[in-house]
Interface confidence: low
């Protein structure tokens, strides 16, 4: 019969014949022959291959380097790579999460619109009229000014985006 020029899915062409690819989690030891099937071996500890393949070496699991602020989010298997994320208070610098940076803090006058996650930084927003923030924080939202009226007090000093209003007693001399 004519030697094949193309092979089925999960096969590869070598020496004019179709051999089975190794399944995910295994590497190629030897190609098939006219008489033998492809020989595959499982990947070792801390190695993986995530596709049907003819690789002679498995890939090393990614190392989540604590010196770069990384920790393991999901341990790798023989078929999947390790997934890294950042330590508390840090977020990934890229989708691949190869290193981390400290979460940004929102300065006084700004509040946290969205708290940072392992993959995204803090989002800050200016405190609108009626709200304030007097701290630099990665968690604090803008707080509403104190309502003097509900305490039967009057505003003695107006609030700003960085300071609360100052309440004081009612002027008793008014008719």
């Amino acid at each position: 019969p004519e030697p094949p020029t193309a092979c089925r899915e999960k096969q590869y062409l070598i020496n004019s014949q179709c051999c089975s690819l190794c399944q995910p989690g295994q590497k190629l030891v030897s190609d098939c022959t006219e008489f033998t099937e492809t020989e595959c071996l499982p990947c070792g500890e801390s190695e993986f291959l995530d596709t049907w393949n003819r690789e002679t070496h498995c890939h090393q699991h990614k190392y989540c380097d604590p010196n770069l602020g990384l920790r393991v989010q999901q341990k790798g298997t023989s078929e999947t790579d390790t997934i890294c994320t950042c330590e508390e208070g840090w977020h990934c610098t890229s989708e691949a999460c190869e290193s981390c940076v400290l979460h940004r803090s929102c300065s006084p006058g700004f509040g946290v619109k969205q708290i940072a996650t392992g993959v995204s930084d803090t989002i800050c927003e200016p405190c609108p009229v009626g709200f304030f923030s007097n701290v630099s924080s990665a968690f604090e939202k803008c707080h509403p000014w104190t309502s003097c009226e509900t305490k039967d007090l009057v505003v003695q000093q107006a609030g700003t985006n960085k300071t609360d209003v100052v309440c004081g007693p009612q002027d008793r001399l008014r008719a």
Epitope: Q60, Y63, D65, N67, L68, T93
Partner: nanobody
Framework: EVQLVESGGALAQPGGSLRLSCEAS????????MAWYRQGPGKPREMVAN???????YYADSVKGRFTLSREGARNTVYLQMNSLKPEDTAVYQC??????????????WGRGTQVTVSS
């Protein structure tokens, strides 16, 4: 064994400038990131800035706009230009090169550190 040699640490006035450099004693292949860390008196070590193999640079908020990181890839040299120095920048600055060794193992080289003191 590759050595990282740091230089440029000194006593500087507040508002002054310094340039730190870190050079590897041999070429390191498969560098993933080069970074400067610092450890101030009584403080934990923190990453100041790092630059990935794709030349993307990241800075800690405390140094953004004041410090600039650059590198010479061929020589595995990384520089930290420090401007508008503040007393709180006082620390031992350590160079770090994060790389993938043969066999795909990710490893680090660390320098011994260079002292930066900001004081009037």
């Amino acid at each position: 064994e590759v050595q990282l040699v740091e230089s440029g640490g000194a006593l500087a006035q507040p508002g002054g400038s310094l340039r730190l450099s870190c050079e590897a004693s041999a070429t390191i292949r498969s560098v993933n990131a080069m970074a400067w860390y610092r450890q101030g008196p009584g403080k934990p070590r923190e990453m100041v800035a790092n630059i990935t193999s794709g030349d993307t640079t990241y800075y800690a908020d405390s140094v953004k706009g004041r410090f600039t990181l650059s590198r010479e890839g061929a020589r595995n040299t990384v520089y930290l230009q420090m401007n508008s120095l503040k007393p709180e920048d006082t620390a031992v600055y350590q160079c770090n090169i994060h790389y993938t060794s043969t066999g795909g193992i990710r490893r680090d080289y660390w320098g011994r550190g260079t002292q930066v003191t900001v004081s009037s």
